[in-house]
């Protein structure tokens, strides 16, 4: 092809490429062709012929202005016509007369700003037709019934005003799952105009100002339609009653939308036509007071989001929203709810009280002052089958006992970004009998004590990373009673004695974050008593990350019971010389990281049994020695393994010796030196 | 099962010393701390010391610690508790009792060992 | 060190009787008490730990309660296998001390 088309498996694309013409020279079994971005004016149907397979074609973001009716005869197996972004103006009864097996049709962004006549009356199997973005009118698209197939009506980001019977009644025979027009200026919905559509199952009305009385209107509208899902995000909806969505009680409307609209009040009863209601979307208002039978009604809710609902209007504690007891009682079935990113005093006895059904609950950043969690603070979820509670960003300064003692259900507990700092007594994880994961990092500081976990011997992933963690090198070890933990993290933590019983018995650890301490000393062979073999035992541990310690010295049997490590990080270490069999039992390692050392030399007795199953190697930025007892070995591996090597040729450079001296390793010559082959 | 079962009585006299081993079966011996009990006759029960028999780390009552050596022979998969300078109050029931999944009980225990300190 | 307190040291009781044991520590030990059961020339049986929760194979007539410094084991109904010596013993910091014990026998 002299054109820069990519083909591959039957598709071309020739996308950015400044082309004023259909490429001529592409195979003729090609499917699916892009032309977007480039520079075409027309579409000549002559160009197409040799490419009759075609059953995707995208030109969008082109400069076309008229489409040629015979477009689709030389494309009789056309079912994706993208359009968009073109200069489209006119579309007359012949424009896709011929393009009948389409079943998506993109027009978005031209300049398309009345349909006339009947131009998609022959798209029987259209499902998608985009008309955003352009500039019409109204939604009239024809004069009689068709486009028995449609199921999404895209009209968003036009300058539609009314919404009349007698321009959607074209539709009489559609079921249209989603009839788009967001961004409009409606203003009127006219008696009758959704009962013209066969079905409707979606509405999406956002970015319209409907304010509170357009919005009864419009749900006065959809009574008795098939209306499923109904989106009215930032419609200036500042409050509700229990007349807004009255109209609503004859459908089965499962999904709501109401985000983005600065509601204030949430006047009781409000949703109490909704009974069918399953998901609903509350995000980014200005809720100043939800009342205890705002959400009365709301039988079926799985899922609510209420991020950023409950904001303060001023600095002043009076200001703070406030949401009554017993206010979610209502919601029987609710399984997740989000309410991250608020300014709620605090939780209340009974706030939770009656979600015999939540599973999740997110309360990060919710609060203003949450400091201390008592054995009251979750009282009201005692009922509640939660298991993933994320209390993160609340500026917790302490857990007192039996905090969460009514969570009995609870897998996950995410306590990070707090300002935690206390002993640990244990007491604070009670009742906690099915516990899978605590998340404790980025806190101030937590002071362990043999029955820190005594009571939560279920927990497979325990998070400390950070916490300016305290006691770790007691016996018997704090971790002792984990016997079923898979991943710990105690990175950053500036950890500096541990003893070799820390992670006794920890044989199911698989992920082990150990980076940015200060264990050093315990690998050095004049530390009082010798080296601190503190991973002994560690059958099944695959990843290891021991990066920034400061570590120069590592004993020759430290990694013997690693046998199914895969990942090791010793990278932004000091290390220089490593004993000849470090690796030997590490057969199955795939990564390895050693970058930023003071490793000179890489010789096979070291290095060859790790690296002999690598996919990835990271030595980058080590003074490598560039002679022939040194790297021999390792160049003539580099340049044979099929290891991933990230940056060989700009920084794995020679040091050593001064005229080899920023010179890239992977050149170094090995032809004169000998016994250097990598394999044998 | 888990089991326990320790050497059997001795008779001592004062100022001698006595070793009590207690052989653990059923488990792996490394993986539990084994703590030792003493009951002398009509008292109540007395913690000694428990020791960690995978690197023979041991933490002690202040109240025994110059007199009580607890040792373990792994290969054994055996602990000993030795006392030295006895006296008639040493005159007791010595037991070896394992923590569980739960590290906050004794649900495993050693038959006991009766010691008695007499002249 | 933590000292442990019970009461009463002895107590008669029949058949079917509810009986309430008592264990004092002299510092807060939080829910980390255990109950143990000794007969005559037995080693202690394991009862309960963490303050209530029951053993394996423990009946339940065998109840606990209590945190911080006072507990308490309660027996619903006695029944003959239950007359023994019974003892509380902490589990917070070494050395974990027990208490003096409580003997229950037969009225």
């Known amino acids: 092809s002299t054109t820069k088309c990519t083909v591959s498996h039957e598709v071309a694309d020739c996308s950015h490429l400044k082309l004023t013409q259909v490429p001529d020279d592409l195979p003729t079994n090609i499917t699916v062709l892009n032309l977007t971005h480039n520079q075409l004016r027309r579409l000549p149907a002559a160009n197409f012929t040799r490419y009759s397979q075609l059953t995707s074609l995208d030109v969008g973001f082109n400069t076309i202005s008229k489409l040629e009716p015979e477009l689709c005869q030389k494309l009789p197996m056309l079912k994706v016509l993208n359009l968009q972004h073109n200069e489209l103006s006119q579309l007359s009864d012949k424009t896709f007369a011929f393009c009948t097996n389409l079943t998506e049709l993109h027009l978005m962004s031209n300049s398309i700003q009345k349909i006339k006549n009947n131009p998609f009356v022959k798209q029987k199997n259209l499902i998608t037709l985009d008309l955003s973005h352009n500039g019409l009118s109204s939604t009239k698209l024809g004069t009689q019934v068709q486009l028995e197939n449609l199921q999404e009506l895209l009209l968003s980001n036009n300058k539609i005003q009314a919404l009349k019977s007698e321009e959607l009644d074209i539709f009489a025979n559609s079921s249209l799952k989603k009839l788009e027009l967001s961004s409009n200026q409606i203003k009127e919905f006219s008696p009758g105009c959704f009962h013209a559509i066969g079905r409707l199952f979606g509405l999406f009305l956002n970015n319209v100002q409907l304010g509170p009385s357009l919005t009864e209107k419009l749900c006065l509208e959809l009574a008795n339609t098939s209306i499923r899902n109904l989106s009215l995000s930032n419609s200036q909806l500042s409050t509700t009653s229990n007349t807004t969505f009255l109209g609503l009680k004859w459908t089965n409307l499962t999904m709501l939308d109401l985000s983005y609209n600065n509601l204030n009040v949430v006047g009781n009863d409000s949703f109490a036509w909704l009974p069918q209601l399953e998901y609903f979307f509350l995000e980014y208002n200005n809720i100043q007071h939800l009342f205890s039978h705002s959400l009365h009604g709301l039988f079926n809710v799985r899922y609510l989001n209420l991020k950023r609902s409950f904001t303060k209007q001023s600095i002043s504690l009076a200001s703070l929203p406030k949401i009554d007891d017993f206010s979610f009682q209502w919601l029987k079935c609710l399984e997740h709810l989000n309410m991250e990113d608020n300014d709620i005093p605090g939780i209340k006895s009974n706030m939770f009280t009656g979600l015999i059904n939540l599973k999740y609950l997110s309360l990060s950043n919710s609060f203003t002052s949450l400091r201390t969690l008592t054995n009251e603070t979750f009282v009201s979820l005692a009922h509640s089958p939660l298991h993933i509670l994320n209390l993160t960003k609340n500026k917790i300064s302490k857990i007192e006992s039996d905090a969460f003692s009514w969570l009995g259900h609870l897998e996950v507990l995410d306590l990070g970004l707090n300002e935690i700092g206390q002993e640990l007594t244990g007491q604070e994880w009670r009742g906690l009998e099915n516990i899978f994961e605590i998340y404790l990092s980025y806190n101030k500081y937590l002071q362990l004590t043999r029955n820190s976990f005594a009571l939560v011997p279920s927990l497979q992933r325990l998070m400390l990373r950070r916490v300016a963690l305290k006691n770790v090198d007691s016996s018997p070890s704090p971790f002792q009673p984990l016997r079923n933990l898979t991943i710990l993290d105690l990175s950053n933590n500036n950890i500096a004695n541990i003893n070799d019983d820390m992670l006794e018995g920890l044989e199911k650890l698989e992920i082990l974050d150990l980076q940015h301490n200060n264990l050093a000393r315990l690998w050095k062979h004049a530390n009082p008593g010798g080296p601190i073999y503190f991973l002994k035992g560690l059958s099944h541990l695959h990843i290891l990350n021991l990066e920034s310690n400061g570590f120069d010295e590592i004993p020759v049997e430290v990694f013997k019971d690693l046998f199914e490590l895969k990942i090791i990080d010793l990278g932004l270490n000091n290390l220089n010389t490593l004993p000849a069999s470090v690796f030997n039992n590490q057969v199955s390692l795939k990564s390895l990281n050693l970058q930023k050392n003071l490793i000179t030399s890489v010789e096979k007795k070291v290095f060859g049994p790790a690296f002999r199953n690598l996919t990835e190697l990271d030595m980058r930025f080590n003074p490598f020695d560039c002679t022939c007892e040194s790297i021999a070995w390792f160049v003539n591996w580099i340049n044979e393994t099929h290891t991933n090597i990230p940056e060989l040729s700009s920084h794995y450079l020679c040091n050593t010796p001064p005229h080899y001296h920023g010179f890239p390793v992977r050149l170094f010559d090995t032809s004169s030196c000998k016994d250097s082959a990598p394999f044998e | 099962q888990v089991q326990l079962v320790q050497s059997g009585a001795e008779v001592k006299k004062p100022g001698a010393s006595v070793k009590v081993s207690c052989k653990a079966s059923?488990?792996?011996?490394?993986?539990?701390?084994i703590h030792w009990v003493r009951q002398a006759p009509g008292q109540r029960l007395e913690w000694m010391g428990e020791i960690n028999p995978n690197n023979g780390r041991i933490n002690y009552n202040e109240k025994f610690k110059t007199r009580v050596t607890i040792t373990r022979d792994t290969s054994a998969s055996t602990a000993y508790m030795e006392l030295s300078s006895l006296r008639s109050e040493d005159t007791a029931v010595y037991y070896c009792?394992?923590?569980?999944?739960?590290?906050?009980?004794?649900?495993?225990w050693g038959q006991g060992t009766l010691v008695t300190v007499s002249s | 060190d933590i000292q442990m307190t019970q009461s009463p040291s002895s107590l008669s009781a029949s058949v079917g009787d509810r009986v309430t044991i008592t264990c004092r520590a002299s510092g807060n030990i939080h829910n980390y008490l255990a109950w143990f059961q000794q007969k005559p020339g037995k080693a202690p049986k394991s009862l309960i730990y963490?303050?209530?929760t029951l053993a394996d194979g423990v009946p339940s007539r065998f109840s606990g309660s209590g945190s911080g410094t006072d507990f308490t084991l309660t027996i619903s109904s006695l029944q003959p296998e239950d007359f023994a010596t019974y003892y509380c013993?902490?589990?917070?910091?070494?050395?974990?001390?027990f208490g003096q014990g409580t003997k229950l026998e037969i009225k």
């Open positions: 059923g488990y792996t011996f490394t993986t539990y701390w």
């Open positions: 963490n303050a209530k």
């Open positions: 009792a394992r923590v569980g999944v739960m590290i906050t009980t004794f649900p495993y």
């Open positions: 013993q902490h589990f917070w910091s070494t050395p974990f001390t």
